[in-house]
């Protein structure tokens, strides 16, 4: 139901949902620090623009008694319970930041009259696509699907001369929240990925995956999985792998591949890693000293959510427009704003665009090297290394089906 918003007379409040169930196991204190860092920046920005207003955040904690699994499985009701708490206390701000779990975001969006914008660090699933007042600041599954289809179809690069139309997807149900929804999107029979591929089979058991690696009767040479190198090693170990197998390891929120002293282990030679272009900014930030490279993106999304709100607030105030209107609620899309780490672009549906990077392991240097980049905003691939030192024959990616000639 409608809740009155603390969002007028020069005082603007941000409601931040601090849920026990979260897309990433990040201490809530770190997220608070990220929000507070963002607030400092926004306040300064507004003051410099001659806008003498107050911006604050209210952190809404759930009691944690009922919803305490710590992951997203029991998040559906936690989000609604928090909204109820806000409603009862009449403490709704101009904008809602959180939740991060797909289940809770979907349910909250469904069960409320959203006359305010909702900004999420997460909500990766396809069920959160195309929501008019929802903004997602971490790459959703739809963006991954579009990359994969684009890459599968590509056949005019020196290192990829075959179009692919087949794939295995490894999904065993123990994935992290981001991976769960990424793989869920690839598995869904009605998804763009499934529609564009001629053959796709989901491998659910470790043994199924392991058998495929050397199975002469396999239907595809390409296996998509999601996680880090350690996850792959646990599954694959030092098993032999057929020379034309290509493993695509989706590991978007992990900067470790770009660190200077990182050497790729031997088991990564048949692997292409899909990750996001790294940022450089959080190393000296007050809120980020305790963050691991895999967590920085989550905290950064919270911070950027605050900055996005500040950006929109500044525009509306400068134009003399009301904040508590549907126009404001629907405005958080189709724009570029200054994020902490550089410009952030949101597409027509409020989803963050980014540069995805496909890495390979150089057989010469045992280092991760950039093979190509992909701009999700324009759905375009840009080759970087035209002569990669691949493990695959002739330094070219193999066909996806063994024995099939050029297309």
């Amino acid at each position: 139901s409608q809740v009155s918003q603390n969002c007028h007379n020069g005082s603007y409040e941000i409601s931040v949902l601090m849920m026990g169930n979260s897309a990433f196991a990040e201490p809530l204190k770190n997220l608070e620090d990220a929000v507070n860092e963002g607030l400092e920046i926004v306040r300064g920005r507004l003051q410099n623009a001659g806008l003498n207003v107050t911006v604050n955040a209210t952190f809404m904690y759930s009691d944690g008694l009922i919803h305490n699994s710590g992951d997203c499985r029991s998040s559906t009701c936690e989000g609604l319970d928090l909204l109820r708490k806000i409603s009862n206390a009449q403490r709704m701000g101009c904008v809602l930041i959180g939740p991060s779990c797909t289940y809770s975001t979907f349910q909250m969006y469904l069960d409320t009259e959203l006359s305010y914008p909702m900004i999420s660090a997460g909500s990766f699933g396809l069920s959160c696509d195309y929501k008019e007042t929802l903004t997602r600041l971490m790459s959703p599954a739809r963006k991954l699907m579009y990359f994969l289809v684009n890459f599968w179809k590509t056949n005019d690069l020196p290192f990829k001369t075959y179009s692919w139309s087949t794939s295995y997807v490894y999904k065993n149900g123990t994935e992290t929240e981001d991976c769960f929804w990424y793989l869920n999107a690839l598995e869904a029979s009605v998804s763009y990925f499934s529609h564009e591929l001629g053959f796709k089979v989901v491998l659910r058991q470790d043994k199924e995956f392991q058998d495929i690696l050397m199975d002469h009767n396999r239907k595809s040479n390409v296996i998509i999985m999601c996680g880090g190198p350690e996850f792959l090693y646990k599954l694959k170990g030092d098993r032999a792998v057929a020379e034309d197998i290509v493993i695509i390891l989706v590991d978007l929120f992990n900067d470790q591949y770009f660190e200077d002293n990182v050497t790729a282990p031997d088991y990564m030679k048949n692997v292409l890693v899909l990750t996001l272009s790294p940022g450089n900014s959080l190393l000296n930030s007050s809120f980020s000293r305790n963050l691991s490279p895999t967590k920085r993106d989550f905290a950064l999304a919270y911070l950027n959510g605050i900055l996005l709100f500040g950006h929109m607030l500044k525009i509306f105030l400068e134009n003399g427009e009301n904040i508590t209107t549907p126009k404001f609620a629907h405005a958080f899309r189709n724009l570029t704003f200054e994020g902490y780490d550089g410009p952030v672009t949101l597409d027509d549906w409020g989803d963050v665009d980014s540069t995805m990077v496909l890495l390979y392991t150089s057989v010469d240097t045992k280092k991760y090297k950039v093979l190509l980049t992909y701009d999700t905003h324009v759905n375009k691939t840009y080759p970087v290394d035209m002569s990669p030192t691949f493990t695959w024959k002739n330094s070219k990616l193999p066909n996806d089906i063994t024995g099939r000639g050029p297309q």
Epitope: I41, R45, G50, N280, S285, G339, D341
Partner: antibody
Amino acid sequence: EVQLLESGGGLVQPGGSLRLSCAASGFTFSRYAMNWVRQAPGKGLEWVSGISGSGGSTYYADSVKGRFTISRDNSKNTLYLQMNSLRAEDTAVYYCAKDRDFWSGPFDYWGQGTLVTVSS
Amino acid sequence: EIVMTPSSATLSVSPGERATLSCRASQSVSRSLAWYQQKPGQAPRLLIYGASTRATGIPARFSGSGSGTEFTLTISSLQSEDVAVYYCQQYNNWMCSFGQGTKLEIK
């Protein structure tokens, strides 16, 4: 007390390169954008380049785009301006200026400037 | 690019009198405007930002007003130490720009 100290200026031939540095102290360096502003002899102020607090955003005046590169090292509290393909019209006093904002705002503290002379 | 144009290159005002400096933007910059004072051989000093907010340590005789495209810096009672060049600057976007400056003299 906020202090900004520029260095690296000097005489250079047309087409040459110089790297200016600005050592900052007295404030949380990574929280604020930094800028380079120049002033040709007897002329007004011209904004040259700016960089956000994190270093994630960089911007340039059209007159220097493609020739100058701004950067910062937040661990050393230092701002840099790499100037390549220098021209006679780049001759000026170059000021390092601290922003009041994380991005683009007014400049609340300025260094004393370093003179760059481009001449053969 | 937003062009900032001062109303005059030079302004002569008697001591104790009011000095009014104006600046026009080629397009709206809302209230993202600053005024600076620069004395010979010195770096510029921030006087006003956000069109009307005095920077730290700036005397109350300095005030700013305006929004959109028309801005004014007023010195209510001119002192001899106020002789300087005054610059307006818009910072509504990253490509900030300065006016050419107004030289304020004692009449």
